[in-house]
């Protein structure tokens, strides 16, 4: 008789999830000498232990602590780039500006980027059919709790000037319900962080509005100011030119506003 299996609203665990996590870990530790000491099989065991055999709506940050401990990594605290709803450009930027780091440039972020996973209560099985959706099912699911945990730690580590890339094409440029708005903003440490600088990325070529005056940006400024952190904002009118100028700062066209 086939065992009854919970049907969730979200997509199931990414195909070959364990193999993908292990392979990414090996690749990352080969590329980053400071993480060569990491034992990828133990990392996978800790990752597995956070969600296997547990109800996928009952996951806690505590479940991920063994993994957090194994993945402890020091990044320059003044070189952190946060992002919201504009991941691809943020990653393209740190690929060029190699001394700046998004969460996905760290081991734990790199392991889990774009993956989905969940288990089932009281079985050692990974659920490849469906996983809980944050809105429709539950917020304390393995993926959401993982990103909440690593995002909080990443924000807590930041110092000096912290940059955040925001998507100017969205109706809410700053969204209080995003990971940035609900986790990272509230975990920046005022005693370490002097300024949060927002880069608002424009979508349309002819868009010359000052999106730093957008009501949601003003809301972000208010939240940040109340936390005794300074706020500044820049429009990035031409993201393609912006990346080009990061690559070739000597280019004569890079002296004008981008």
């Amino acid at each position: 008789v086939p065992r009854w299996r919970q049907q969730w609203s979200g997509p199931g665990t990414t195909k070959r999830f364990p193999e993908t996590v292990l392979a990414r870990c090996v690749k990352y530790t080969e590329i980053h000498p400071e993480m060569r000491h990491v034992d990828c099989q133990s990392v996978w065991d800790a990752f597995k232990g956070a969600f296997i055999s547990k109800h996928p709506c009952n996951i806690t940050e505590e479940d991920y602590q063994p993994l957090m401990k194994l993945g402890t990594q020091t990044v320059p605290c003044n070189k952190i780039l946060l992002w919201s709803r504009i991941k691809d450009l943020a990653h393209q930027f740190t690929q060029v500006q190699r001394d700046m780091f998004t969460l996905e440039d760290t081991l734990l972020g790199y392991l889990a980027d774009d993956l989905t996973w969940c288990g089932e209560f009281n079985t050692s099985k990974i659920n490849y059919q469906s996983c809980p959706d944050w809105r429709k099912d539950c917020s304390n699911n393995p993926v959401s709790v993982f990103w909440k945990t690593v995002s909080r730690r990443f924000a807590e580590a930041a110092c000096d000037v912290v940059h955040v890339m925001l998507n100017g094409s969205r109706s809410k440029i700053f969204d209080k319900n995003s990971t940035f708005g609900s986790v990272e903003v509230h975990n920046l440490q005022p005693e370490k962080v002097q300024t949060l600088e927002a880069w608002v990325i424009h979508g349309g070529r002819e868009d010359s509005r000052d999106l730093c005056q957008d009501p949601t940006i003003k809301e972000l400024e208010s939240i940040i100011s109340k936390r005794n952190i300074q706020f500044s904002c820049k429009n990035i009118y031409r993201p393609d030119k912006f990346l080009q100028c990061v690559k070739n700062p000597e280019d004569s066209s890079c002296t004008s506003e981008i």
């Epitope: 193999e19 292990l22 099989q41 996978w44 065991d45 597995k48 050692s124």
Partner: antibody
């Protein structure tokens, strides 16, 4: 039908090395991990280490670190265990055993065992 | 390392008896526990995985239970071919560790 066939018995002098092989057939070699477990005469089972062939990574129990090297050759579907600086306490039957990469299950298949005798 | 402690270390029983072997982990291992049967001069054979799931081809008289730190292997009605040594093993973390074994002998 999955089979793990190990190399034959060995008699070694203290201080020397031994290399035991484990050839897998009847399954996808790269989809699994291979562990080495030993059993001294009249004693229990002791896990030595594990290799994941498709990643080329291995780890071993701290007790054996620096003495054991676990490798795999994907082209011949063979896992190897090399134990150096042998002493009399290493006299044991050495088993290879297969598990899934995610290790969400047990060792489902075992080799027949290889007796290694260390004696001067 | 996680220590696995089995009890008893040996027991005598008759054909048809109900036999229970326990295994305790020194820290929580969820349900990442396997049971193996080993006969003299033979390789171990997997009986139970995930604490309570029966390996295919294993008779239903074998069952496993437990989660966290305390686990049990039960043979509901001992058969002549069941006289052997039984080992528990955790696969929650490295290094993988086994219990010291329980020898089931004929009374």
């Amino acid at each position: 039908q999955v089979q793990l066939v190990q190399s034959g018995a060995e008699v070694k002098k203290p201080g020397s090395s031994v290399k035991v092989s484990c050839k897998a057939s009847g399954g996808t070699f790269s989809s699994y991990a291979f562990s080495w477990v030993r059993q001294a005469p009249g004693q229990g089972l002791e896990w030595m280490g594990r290799v994941i062939p498709f990643l080329g990574i291995a780890n071993s129990a701290q007790k054996f670190q620096g003495r054991v090297t676990i490798t795999a050759d994907k082209s011949t579907s063979t896992a190897y265990m090399d134990l150096s600086s042998l002493r009399s306490e290493d006299t044991a039957v050495y088993y290879c055993a297969r598990d899934d990469i995610a290790a969400l299950g047990p060792f489902d298949y075992w080799g027949q065992g290889t007796l290694v005798t260390v004696s001067s | 390392d996680i220590q696995m402690t089995q009890s008893p270390s040996s027991l005598s029983a008759s054909v048809g008896d109900r036999v229970t072997i326990t295994c305790r982990a020194s820290q929580g291992i969820s349900s990442h526990l396997a049971w193996y049967q080993q006969k003299p001069e033979k390789a171990p054979k997997s009986l139970i995985y995930a604490a309570s799931s029966l390996q295919s081809g294993v008779p239903s008289r074998f069952s496993g239970s437990g989660s966290g730190t305390d686990f049990t292997l039960t043979i509901s009605s001992l058969q002549p071919e069941d006289f052997a040594t039984y080992y528990c093993q955790q696969y929650n973390s490295y290094p993988r560790t086994f219990g010291q074994g329980t020898k089931v002998e004929i009374k």
